[in-house]
Interface confidence: low
């Protein structure tokens, strides 16, 4: 587990839970990297999920300087789409098919956050989004941008970890 | 540079309802996220709700949690505030204000200073 104040994180069980949360995104929807639904009003939806950014330290140097700040960011991130996967979104009509990885890609998520979650230290993380899509045409449509933009923002927290586990590892 | 205009609100009976407005003009204003807050007399500025850019996030102060509905129409760049079962600790000057990013991670969506555009703001009174 992570502990505050600056000290490492199991680099290397983040790195190979990172990697199975990678497999899981893609095997979850893996037409996601063939599609590319630009209707109206994409943009806006797609900018309500996180995104690892420029200054969230998740660069090397960042990481070097103080992880905190960037495995803030990816729990954050990882909490986020634990919400967002055990929601209505995907719980809803309808049903996903009995063998969706979706639910050990829930699973997986949750596990992650909770290996970076520090030792008697609760990073503070916002109340349950509140999602209510009325008709099952639109859970579909969000389903789809959320694993799309749940995949990349794995690849870039995988990438993450197994530069960690190479170069920051105790 | 965003204008942001409140309007809906006034003198209401304690248990009735209003619902607020909150246009938006100026640059595209269509993703902004867009949160909504309260000031009463002699009060420090409390937190309303919240709604991210596309309307996927929607987060509500407890006190508020059952009662109040925050939406939002992209194509008239307004946001609202339904407000339902009012009573008298509702009445506060309401303002809109939008911050130049979407806060959908943390804990900065609740905090005034996270937010660069803010309306005049409507007086909402409850009388019971």
């Known amino acids: 587990r992570a502990v505050p104040g600056g000290s490492s994180p199991a680099w290397t069980q983040c790195q190979q839970l990172s990697q199975k949360l990678c497999t899981l995104a893609w095997s979850a929807h893996p037409l996601v990297g063939h599609m590319d639904l630009r209707e109206e009003g994409d943009e806006e939806t797609t900018n309500d999920v996180p995104h690892i950014q420029c200054g969230d330290g998740c660069d090397p140097q960042g990481l070097r300087d103080n992880s905190q700040f960037c495995l803030q960011r990816i729990h954050q991130g990882l909490i986020f789409y634990e919400k967002l996967l055990g929601s209505d979104i995907f719980t809803g009509e309808p049903s996903l098919l009995p063998d969706s990885p979706v639910g050990q890609l829930h699973a997986s998520l949750l596990g992650l956050s909770q290996l970076l979650q520090p030792e008697g230290h609760h990073w503070e993380t916002q109340q349950i989004p509140s999602l209510s899509p009325s008709q099952p045409w639109q859970r579909l449509l969000l389903r789809f941008k959320i694993l799309r933009s749940l995949q990349a923002f794995v690849a870039v927290a995988a990438r993450v970890f197994a530069h960690g586990a190479a170069t920051l590892s105790p | 540079e965003v204008q942001l205009v409140e309007s809906g609100g006034g003198l209401v009976q304690a248990g009735g309802s209003l619902r607020l407005s909150c246009a938006a003009s100026g640059r595209t204003s269509s993703s902004y996220s867009m949160g909504w807050f309260r000031q009463a007399p002699g009060k420090e500025r409390e937190f309303v709700a919240y709604i991210s850019g596309g309307g996927l996030t929607i987060y509500y102060a407890h006190s508020v949690k059952g009662r109040f509905t925050i939406s939002r129409d992209n194509a008239k760049n307004t946001v609202y505030l339904q407000m339902n079962s009012l009573n008298s600790a509702d009445t506060a000057v309401y303002s809109c204000?939008?911050?130049?990013?979407?806060?959908?991670?943390?804990?900065?969506?609740?905090?005034?200073?996270?937010?660069?555009?803010w309306g005049q703001g409507t007086q909402v009174t409850v009388s019971s």
């Open positions: 204000a939008a911050p130049k990013r979407d806060l959908y991670l943390g804990s900065r969506y609740p905090v005034p200073e996270s937010y660069d555009y």
